[in-house]
Interface confidence: medium
């Protein structure tokens, strides 16, 4: 018995179905085939869970959170014991093991390992201004999404003809900040933050209005 090498890992967008592959070769009939799929969740590495079980010609449910969402891709018994997970959740991210036993085949490698990462597009980011908007001040434009896997990067643009930030601006695409030093009237305008990752983008807008000093009455 030899379980085939699995692809290292699989990525799927949240809510989409995932197929976790596991196939094996065996010299014995599939009369005594036992298959267990286990997961070590990323969120709780100390607590492996049973996903689905095939034993004695019957299928058995694993952990309650998988009920109704998991099944073998083909009719069992078979040498392809891949499974599907429907409506993938963030909590499904983890390391999955298929364990195969098919007596009397002694077996070489009887475990297949596949990583599953459930990807989440960035949620609508929150845009805000930090600091005084008085002319000559320094301001920081902040942008962050509550959700997003992999972690989103943030790109700020000024919505004018050039889409360029003012020359005094410095941008941190990881933190989602733009620092604009010594703001002037030219700094005023609409700014857009684009949060993006491997599977999606999301935006927010911010209106920066630089306040000019009030002319003092002389009299």
């Amino acid at each position: 018995l030899e379980v085939s090498e699995s692809p290292g890992s699989i990525q799927v967008a949240r809510g989409q179905p995932a197929v976790l592959p596991c196939t094996f070769t065996t010299s014995a009939a599939l009369i005594n085939l036992n298959v267990i799929w286990m997961v070590t969740p990323l969120s709780n590495a100390n607590q492996p869970e049973q996903v689905i079980l095939y034993q004695g010609g019957q299928m058995f449910d694993g952990a309650p959170r998988f009920h109704g969402r998991v099944g073998f891709t083909g009719t069992m018994p078979a040498t392809n014991v891949s499974i599907f997970i429907n409506n993938t959740q963030l909590s499904d991210t983890g390391t999955y093991q298929c364990l195969v036993n098919n007596l009397p085949d002694i077996g070489g490698r009887n475990i297949g390992v596949t990583g599953l990462t459930v990807l989440v597009p960035p949620s609508a980011p929150h845009c805000q201004i930090q600091g005084s908007q008085d002319i000559g001040s320094d301001v920081i434009l902040l942008c962050s999404s509550e959700e997003g896997i992999p972690r989103p990067t943030y790109l700020w643009e000024k919505l004018d003809n050039t889409l360029k930030l003012p020359p005094t601006a410095t941008q941190d695409q990881v933190q989602g900040t733009v620092t604009i030093r010594n703001i002037s009237a030219l700094s005023s305008g609409l700014y857009q933050c684009v949060a993006s990752n491997a599977i999606g983008t999301s935006t927010c807008l911010l209106d920066l209005q630089v306040i000019s000093p009030q002319p003092r009455n002389i009299g």
């Epitope: 005594n32 364990l99 002694i106 070489g108 490698r109 009887n110």
Partner: antibody, heavy 120, light 107 residues
Amino acid sequence: QVQLVQSGAEVKKPGSSVKVSCKASGGTFSSYAISWVRQAPGQGLEWMGGIIPIFGTANYAQKFQGRVTITADKSTSTAYMELSSLRSEDTAVYYCARARGSTWGYFDYWGQGTLVTVSS
Amino acid sequence: EIVLTQSPASLSLSPGERVTLSCRASQSVSNYLAWYQQKPGQAPRLLIYDASNRATGIPARFSGSGSGTDFTLTISSLEPEDFAVYYCQQRDNWPLTFGGGTKVEIK
């Protein structure tokens, strides 16, 4: 580091039974085959049978079929080997051994051994 | 069952010498053969698996070769701690079987 700790030495009468335990620590217990191998004084190694705890089904050498029972308790990460109808030639050191990687057949971790003496 | 015959049964050598141990199977076991070392009062220790792969932590002086029915364990230069009994074992078929062992003694 995986460790297999076996129960202590036993002296038994012919015709009786002995049950030896093997407690695993430091690794995943359920997924790996645990086998029992015995060694009579001054003799070689003899495989008796084994079990993959997560499946619960054991596999035995024909020679011991009907006389040996191998079980595993996943909750305590402990495997057991019970040998019945003991005779003097069952006097041996009994080892539990964990399969290398995920295979049934090679043993990379061994218990310290349990001496079972069968004597009237 | 598959019978494994080891030869010689014992041999006396000095540290630094090269040693070659043989294991012959009664029928082909492909490359599904392992070698173990056992010292008095200790459990066996896995040296080689699948005929030629060194187990974790095993020094490079130990090497295995062969396939089918004829296998060899070679120790390129004996160290004092290498004097022990060596067993071969097959996993090609049930039951798993071991050879009778070769005792390597200090001359």
